[in-house]
Interface confidence: medium
């Protein structure tokens, strides 16, 4: 990456305009405060990529870090990133503004930290003080970063003089947290409410006698304060509770509710947050998908599950072929709807030892006064195949026929095979498949019927053998998605007076 001008530190005039160019062999982009500023990207004819960042009407607030990086830094070395620091000395800007979170520095161990008070002019002398003291602290200062060192749990301010004016920074608060010393828990009666309903939150602290609660919540930001109530749970020693109650919630009350608890003796603090969602009206939403065709195996148990989100709690009904289902006294059907989280539900229909009659069209309907959803599917009962009949006959035509009949759901496939060497078959010799169109010595005719009442297919297949010159083991195998069944018959030539 090539940055023009190269820096790494530039001092620019207030109200001026300045152009920064970054170029590289891949697309490049300028970043400022974790955001890509408006900029223009180009590709030169030599294949070089560039991005031009124009800083117009510069003010002290433009002081800070600028990074040029590859637009897509995946797979690129971390050093493929150029940093440039720009100062715009501006007497109207004292210390650069900090985000609120930068004013609070929390530590869980003794370590070096930086108090990030920065000025727009690298020539200014900056000193660090405890908030309540005039003496400058002997801590090194970096104009680009601030004061770095090991600090005690205190409040600090930075001072500088601009012209004849002494300027103070905001106060920075350093907190060394003993994580175990204070333990806050926050919960809500409901984290989802409809507008007009109440929001009630509780913040509980255990093991402290004197604490201070501070709530932050969406209404507070708009200046509408709600007075929390603090009480002691007398049945438990040192359990102190603060209750925040907002009657008749509005959509704008959605957001993060934070309970900050400080304990003044050791100056410990902890905070917990919870998200509250205020919805215009109730809802029911399906989660995930259930296929429109479901399967169950005959005489096995099958549970059909639907997951959905709802508020307020819904009524759940199941239907089969448009008739309402209920828990059967015989224990053949079990219905249950479980609340797995505040607004998430799992509804289950369990068919115990499934019967053919339980095939059909099922619907689950979840509803309340504001919304409803329904989900439907067809349930197919799968029946393992069985060979019901395997018989051999000698029609007058001189050929010999073997008839195989079987049933199952879904539709069975039929496979005919034969073995000529009875002694070695089927252990040593694999059987030969029959009925292929290329086989001239056998012909195959298969018919399939669907039996509506039994909801299964019947397959009847007839194998015609042109000339059988020695005993032949003929095997009929039926196969479907849930099983297979085989029967075998030995066909002897016409000339032999007996059958094995």
């Amino acid at each position: 990456l090539v940055v023009t001008p190269p820096g790494p530190e530039l001092v620019l005039n207030v109200s001026s305009t300045f152009v920064l160019t970054c170029s590289g062999s891949a697309p490049v982009v300028w970043e400022r405060m974790s955001q890509e500023p408006p900029q223009e990207m180009a590709k030169a004819q030599d294949g070089t990529f560039s991005s031009v960042l124009t800083l117009t009407n510069l003010t002290g607030l433009d002081t800070g870090e600028y990074f040029c990086t590859h637009n897509d830094s995946r797979g690129l070395e971390t050093d493929e990133r150029k940093r440039l620091y720009i100062f715009v000395p501006d007497p109207t800007v004292g210390f650069l503004p900090n985000d609120a979170e930068e004013l609070f520095i929390f530590l869980t161990e003794i370590t070096e930290i930086t108090i990030p008070c920065r000025v727009t002019d690298p020539q200014l002398v900056v000193t660090l003080h405890e908030k309540k003291g005039d003496v400058a602290l002997p801590v090194p200062y970096d104009h680009q970063r601030g004061f770095s060192g090991i600090f005690e749990d205190r409040s600090y301010i930075c001072k500088t003089t601009i012209g004849d004016r002494e300027v103070d920074s905001d106060a920075y608060y350093v907190y060394r947290l003993q994580v175990s010393s204070i333990n806050v828990s926050v919960n809500a009666v409901q984290t989802v409410v409809r507008q007009g309903e109440n929001i009630t939150l509780m913040c509980i602290v255990i093991g402290n006698e004197v604490v201070n609660f501070e709530w932050t919540y969406p209404r507070k930001e708009s200046g509408r304060l709600v007075e929390p109530v603090t009480d002691f749970l007398l049945d438990m020693p040192y359990h102190i509770r603060s209750i925040l109650h907002i009657p008749s919630a509005e959509l704008e009350d959605s957001g993060t509710y934070t309970c900050n608890v400080t304990e003044s003796v050791n100056d410990h603090q902890d905070e917990k947050a919870i998200n509250i969602t205020v919805v215009e009206s109730g809802y029911v939403r399906l989660l995930g998908e259930v296929g429109t065709l479901q399967f169950a195996e005959l005489h096995r148990s099958r549970t059909l599950q639907v997951v959905f989100e709802a508020y307020p709690p819904p009524t759940v009904l199941w239907f089969k072929d448009n008739r309402t289902l209920g828990d059967s006294s015989a224990g053949e059907i079990a219905l249950s709807t479980r609340n797995v989280s505040e607004t998430r539900y799992v509804s289950e229909l369990t068919l115990v030892r499934v019967k053919v009659a339980e095939a059909g069209h099922y619907t689950m309907r979840a509803f309340h006064e504001d919304a409803e959803v329904q989900l439907s599917f067809q349930l197919q009962i799968n029946v393992p195949v069985r060979v019901l009949e395997l018989s051999e006959s000698h029609p007058d035509s001189g050929e010999q026929t073997v008839r195989c009949r079987g049933r199952g759901m879904p539709q069975p496939n039929i496979i005919w095979s034969a073995c000529r060497d009875l002694k070695r078959c089927p252990r040593e010799l694999p059987p030969t498949l029959l009925g292929n169109s290329s086989e001239e010595e056998s012909q195959l005719e298969t018919n399939v019927t669907y039996w509506e009442e039994e909801q299964e297919f019947e397959v009847v297949s007839t194998l015609r053998l042109q000339h059988v010159d020695r005993p032949l083991s003929v095997r009929c195998t039926l196969r479907n998605a849930v099983g297979q069944d085989t029967q075998e018959v030995i066909v002897v030539p016409h000339s032999l007076p007996f059958k094995v």
């Epitope: 405060m33 890509e36 900029q39 223009e40 124009t54 117009t56």
Partner: antibody
Framework: EVQLLESGGDLVQPGGSLRLSCAAS????????MSWVRQAPGKGLEWVST????????YYADSVKGRFTISRDNSKNTLYLQMNSLRAEDTAIYYC????????????????WGLGTLVTVSS | DIVMTQSPESLAVSLGERATINCKSS????????????LAWYQQKPGQPPKLLIY???TRESGVPDRFSGSGSGTDFTLTISSLQAEDVAVYYC?????????FGQGTNLEIK
């Protein structure tokens, strides 16, 4: 009064070339970035190219990159667009537009537009 | 590239009534450092070039009647004509100029009902 007058539009065969010009008056031409924007018949607006004040930096839409070249002659108050390897999809009215940007290069809107010149690419 | 999507594609409003056109960008075009939205609105009448109405999402170009106003921030923007006049019949386009390639919405055709 600001005036931008495009010329050079014509009927050209696919693969052919054309050079558009835009003569500017009523502005300090050398102080502003300039652009070309096109509009296919019955369609919306599509940015084509921008050239910086000093002509040191040029930007192109992907659809024309490598085929079109934008340039300017500040002494003649004129903007150019050299179009090579023309395709049927380049058929459009080409507008010359003045950028609001007064520096070498900066993201900007278009505050003045010419009347446009029609380029037709057809065999 | 930043994709600009306008809605509706076509709009018929009675004279004197309010017309509202929406524009949505596929990514944020508000730059926090200067708190500016890099969005412009243009009006194009049949057979004429586009004319700048609004820039920085809400600043009216000089000479543009005050019945035209722009609002919105981040990714969602609106052009409002408070009381439609016969001469406002045109196609309206939004455009982002946050960075190249500059992109326009597909246009909204405004007619009189």
């Amino acid at each position: 009064e600001v005036q931008l007058l495009e010329s050079g539009g014509d009927l050209v065969q696919p693969g052919g070339s054309l050079r558009l010009s835009c003569a500017a008056s009523g502005i300090t031409f050398s102080s502003f970035a300039m652009s070309w924007v096109r509009q296919a018949p019955g369609k919306g607006l599509e940015w084509v190219s921008t050239v910086s004040v000093s002509a040191g930096i040029t930007y192109y839409a992907d659809s024309v990159k490598g085929r079109f070249t934008i340039s300017r002659d500040n002494s003649k108050n004129t903007l150019y667009l050299q179009m090579n390897s023309l395709r049927a999809e380049d058929t459009a009215i080409y507008y010359c537009a003045k950028s609001s940007c007064t520096t070498n290069s900066c993201p900007a809107y278009f505050d003045y537009w010419g009347l446009g010149t029609l380029v037709t690419v057809s065999s | 590239d930043i994709v600009m999507t306008q809605s509706p594609e076509s709009l018929a409003v009675s004279l004197g009534e309010r017309a509202t056109i929406n524009c949505k960008s596929s990514q944020n075009i508000l730059y926090r450092s200067n708190n500016k939205n890099y969005l412009a609105w243009y009006q194009q009448k049949p057979g004429q070039p586009p004319k700048l109405l609004i820039y920085w999402a809400s600043t009216r170009e000089s000479g543009v009647p005050d019945r035209f106003s722009g609002s919105g921030s981040g990714t969602d923007f609106t052009l409002t004509i408070s009381s439609l006049q016969a001469e406002d019949v045109a196609v309206y386009y939004c455009q982002q100029y946050y960075g190249t390639p500059y992109t326009f919405g597909q246009g909204t055709n405004l007619e009189i009902k």
